[in-house]
Amino acid sequence: MMTGTIETTGNISAEKGGSIILQCHLSSTTAQVTQVNWEQQDQLLAICNADLGWHISPSFKDRVAPGPGLGLTLQSLTVNDTGEYFCIYHTYPDGTYTGRIFLEVLESSVAEHGARFQIP
């Protein structure tokens, strides 16, 4: 029986050109998390695997950074980044838990959940 629940950042908005942190939190289960996937519609953005660490999809490498924690940071946002994002927790023995976040990228507004980056 799957007892866990996923809490997400919900519906969020951010400014074009800015950054946003996507976060999900799995709770109320003792199941062991083995992998967390981040997906945008049907595209894989990133994976955090228990044995292999983080893998960022090559097409997103310049604009996606892992963390904080099991979250994901999207940088240099464009209007095309507007849409649904999913965190998929693979657990044993429960199975899969999925959380949904809707991101709206605005032409000009105050960015929420902004992240500060330093890229050498």
């Epitope: 809490e7 942190i21 976060q23 939190h25 799995l26 709770s27 003792t30 998390v33 083995t34 992998q35 967390v36 955090c48 695997n49 228990a50 292999l52 660490g53 983080w54 893998h55 960022i56 490498k61 950074a65 892992p66 963390g67 904080p68 924690g69 099991l70 992240a115 500060r116 980056f117 330093q118 890229i119 050498p120």
Partner: antibody, heavy 117, light 107 residues
Framework: QVQLQQPGSELVRPGASVKLSCKAS????????MHWVKQRHGQGLEWIGN????????NYDEKFKNKGTLTVDTSSNTAYMHLSSLTSDDSAVYYC??????????WGQGTTLTVSS | DIVLTQSPATLSVTPGDSVSLSCRAS??????LHWFQQKSLESPRLLIN???QSISGIPSRFRGSGSGTDFTLSINNLETEDFGMYFC?????????FGGGTKLEIK
């Protein structure tokens, strides 16, 4: 098996700089955050900052922004922390720690930095 | 920055006792809270991650609970090897922060 190897100690003069190292083995170095943590004698743990070797992205605690610089050498699987303008306040044990799916799951043994004339 | 406050600062107990250590966050960190044990002259060791997830190789007498701002590390039937320092840490947002620690000492 995963290992993070740090030199046991470093002795430096006040005003000088030092580059602490953390050599990683047993895992894919570029796929995990590497963090640096400071612990003064008998005190608590202070998070200095982190670096993602796969991209070079760094984050720092504001307190350490003008004190430490984090770098990596992916060819040798080694993380570095450069500390500048050293004072006695910088005397401490400095740990490197790996963060993956299970948070800070592996730590180095720590380098004891002594700043003394 | 998120401040983590641990209490009590020191706890004097007898082997065989059960104890609860508290960690309180200055704002909600959901379940991004981890517990570490540190013995004298050793590196910290991860005990519990994400508030309540058990770690391979850690005895089952260590249990974590809580969410949001209030978290607890419970240790049942204390053994002599359990004495030392305990720290909580949040990874909900950068900068990551640690609590000031609780010293568990033998009465």
């Amino acid at each position: 098996q995963v290992q993070l190897q740090q030199p046991g100690s470093e002795l430096v003069r006040p005003g000088a700089s030092v580059k602490l190292s953390c050599k990683a083995s047993g895992y894919t170095f570029t796929s995990y955050w590497m963090h640096w943590v400071k612990q003064r004698h008998g005190q608590g743990l202070e998070w200095i900052g982190n670096i993602f070797p796969g991209s070079g992205i760094t984050n720092y605690d504001e307190k350490f922004k003008n004190k430490g610089t984090l770098t990596v050498d992916t060819s040798s699987n080694t993380a570095y922390m450069h500390l500048s303008s050293l004072t006695s306040d910088d005397s401490a044990v400095y740990y490197c720690a790996r963060e993956g799916l299970y948070a800070f799951d592996y730590w180095g043994q720590g380098t004891t930095l002594t700043v003394s004339s | 920055d998120i401040v983590l406050t641990q209490s009590p600062a020191t706890l004097s107990v007898t082997p065989g006792d059960s104890v609860s250590l508290s960690c309180r966050a200055s704002q909600s960190i959901r379940n991004s809270l981890h517990w570490f044990q540190q013995k004298s002259l050793e590196s910290p060791r991860l005990l519990i991650n994400y508030a309540s997830q058990s770690i391979s190789g850690i005895p089952s007498r260590f249990r974590g609970s809580g969410s949001g701002t209030d978290f607890t590390l419970s240790i049942n039937n204390l053994e002599t090897e359990d004495f030392g320092m305990y720290f909580c840490q949040q990874t909900n947002s950068w900068p990551y922060t640690f609590g000031g620690g609780t010293k568990l000492e033998i009465k």
